[in-house]
Interface confidence: low
């Protein structure tokens, strides 16, 4: 039975040209995290594998940095980066947990960096 829950940074906004940290946190389970996939709609951004470490998709290598933790940092944001992002936790023995983040990249300086939780 899957007892875990994923907390995410929820709906966030950032300024064009800036950077943003996407974070998810899996709680309420003792399952072992074997891999975390970060995806944008149907595109793979990055993988953090417990044994192999990070792999960043070639299309994003210039703009994506691993971390902090299992999170992902997006840099040099463009308006085209607006959309849904998913953190997909592969765990044993529970299976797969998915969290959703919506990022809006704004042209002006009115972006508010909202976050539902902080990871120190």
């Amino acid at each position: 039975m899957m007892t875990g829950t994923i907390e995410t940074t929820g709906n966030i906004s950032a300024e064009k040209g800036g950077s943003i940290i996407l974070q998810c946190h899996l709680s309420s389970t003792t399952a072992q995290v074997t891999q975390v996939n970060w995806e944008q709609q149907d595109q793979l951004l990055a993988i953090c594998n417990a044994d192999l470490g990070w792999h960043i998709s070639p299309s994003f290598k210039d703009r994506v940095a691993p971390g902090p933790g299992l999170g992902l940092t997006l840099q040099s944001l463009t308006v085209n980066d607006t959309g849904e992002y998913f953190c997909i936790y592969h765990t044993y023995p529970d299976g797969t947990y998915t969290g959703r983040i919506f990022l809006e990249v704004l042209e002006s300086s009115v972006a508010e960096h909202g976050a539902r939780f902080q990871i120190p």
Partner: antibody, heavy 116, light 107 residues
């Protein structure tokens, strides 16, 4: 000017270890991955692994997982690679290079000779 | 691991000619291919990234094309200084791998 500086040569005995350096200058060390590449005399290039100075994350080519250890000294903007249990097969030029996926800056290489 | 096969192994041409090197991947890798030049006793130098993207400071006679499994590096009007080994390298999946290289000799 962006540079990666490596010592020219290391002579080591079979069974010993060697630790070579790669000193970065001209850019922010913690924002670019450092890769290590092996080239045996007259042969092609082999990727050993990479390390991200911003977080110390490493990735290894499975072939070198028990041979190479990648470390950092961020205070001096220097990356290190230690090779253990050396044999004649480890005699090669070892390059460090900068980048994730593509390698835009290369050191001059360290020639490691394993000989008794 | 992804295998990259380069051809020809050796190419001998006269200055001013156009040359092409081939790199074939063992599986589809999109455009995740780089090309490097390595002169005798020198370090590799990045020529092309992601299949066809040019690199600052590299002469415009160097160009790359291809996607999927088949890639080409072309040199339009070869110069004597282009005498070197040329390697392709994939960044689609760890471990990154290089092709076996192609040697360009200038007559």
């Amino acid at each position: 000017q962006v540079q990666l500086q490596q010592p020219g040569a290391e002579l080591v005995k079979p069974g010993a270890s060697v630790k070579m350096s790669c000193k970065a200058s001209g850019y922010t060390f913690t924002t670019f991955w450092i890769n290590w590449v092996k080239q045996r005399p007259g042969q092609g290039l082999e990727w050993i692994g990479d390390i991200f100075p911003g977080r110390g994350i490493t990735n290894y080519n499975g072939k070198f997982k028990n041979k190479a250890t990648l470390t950092l000294d961020t205070s001096s903007s220097t990356a290190y690679m230690q090779l253990s249990s050396l044999t004649s097969e480890d005699s090669a030029v070892y390059y460090c290079s900068r980048g994730l996926g593509y390698f835009d800056v290369w050191g001059a290489g360290t020639t490691v000779t394993v000989s008794s | 691991d992804i295998l990259l096969t380069q051809s020809p192994a050796i190419l001998s041409v006269s200055p001013g000619e156009r040359v092409s090197f081939s790199c074939r991947a063992s599986q589809s890798i999109g455009t995740s291919i780089q090309w490097y030049q390595q002169r005798t006793n020198g370090s590799p130098r990045l020529l092309i990234k992601y299949g066809s993207e040019s690199i600052s400071g590299i002469p415009s006679r160097f160009s790359g094309s291809g996607s999927g499994t088949d890639f080409t590096l072309s040199i339009n009007s070869v110069e004597s200084e282009d005498s070197a080994d040329y390697y392709c390298q994939q960044s689609y999946r760890w471990p990154y791998t290089f092709g076996g290289g192609s040697k360009l000799e200038i007559k």
